[in-house]
Interface confidence: low
């Protein structure tokens, strides 16, 4: 039976240019992690393999820093960057668990709500 | 808007501990994330640590197992407890938090004998 439970950042905001942590946590459960997948929509951004570290996608790796822990930390961000990332952990034996984050980025300084910040 | 000020800063002996506050006014962290970053002089600056609503933690390895990253919804305020510190942690410290809009004036942090 899955019992574990992924805590988000949930629906955050970014300016344009500027830079954001993504961040999930999975709690609740003794299964093991054996990846976790990084995607926006239907493309995949990046991997980290417990036994074989991260793997950045090549389209992505100018952009994409891994970290903090499981987390992942976009730069340089566009009104393209907006919409639907997913962390998915793969345990055992659990199985599978997905958490949701929504991004807006935004052209004005006028990102209102969300867990945002600037990296100069 | 948001407004974010840090304190708690100052000179300390290496070896020694300080904590950090940071007030949000205007719009709450009512959740999400909160995180504390530093910039050293002539450096980029850095995340240092990072926790999320329900009170999962996240530090930069140069950190962990010295320094405590905590938030209180209820006050608005996130803290940076950091004991054991070096020389190396010379820096201002930055928080940021849900709606934030430009940085905080920081507060500064010197380890120094």
């Known amino acids: 039976m899955m019992t574990g439970t992924i805590e988000t950042t949930g629906n955050i905001s970014a300016e344009k240019g500027g830079s954001i942590i993504l961040q999930c946590h999975l709690s609740s459960t003794t299964a093991q992690v054996t990846q976790v997948n990084w995607e926006q929509q239907d493309q995949l951004l990046a991997i980290c393999n417990a036994d074989l570290g991260w793997h950045i996608s090549p389209s992505f790796k100018d952009r994409v820093a891994p970290g903090p822990g499981l987390g992942l930390t976009l730069q340089s961000l566009t009104v393209n960057d907006t919409g639907e990332y997913f962390c998915i952990y793969h345990t055992y034996p659990d199985g599978t668990y997905t958490g949701r984050i929504f991004l807006e980025v935004l052209e004005s300084s006028v990102a209102e709500h969300g867990a945002r910040f600037q990296i100069p | 808007e948001v407004q974010l000020v840090e304190s708690g800063g100052g000179l300390v002996q290496p070896g020694g501990s300080l904590r950090l506050s940071c007030a949000a006014s205007?719009?709450?962290?009512?959740?999400?994330?909160m995180g504390w970053f530093r910039q050293a002089p002539g450096k980029e600056r850095e995340w240092v640590a990072s926790?999320?609503?329900?009170?999962?933690?996240w530090y930069a390895d140069s950190v962990k197992g010295r320094f405590t990253i905590s938030a209180d919804n209820s006050k608005n305020t996130a803290y940076l407890q950091m004991n054991s510190l070096k020389p190396e942690d010379t820096a201002v410290y930055y928080c940021?938090?849900?709606?934030?809009?430009?940085w905080g004036q920081g507060t500064l942090v010197t380890v120094s004998s």
């Open positions: 205007g719009n709450t962290f009512s959740g999400g994330f």
């Open positions: 940021t938090t849900e709606g934030f809009d430009p």
């Open positions: 926790v999320l609503r329900g009170g999962y933690t």
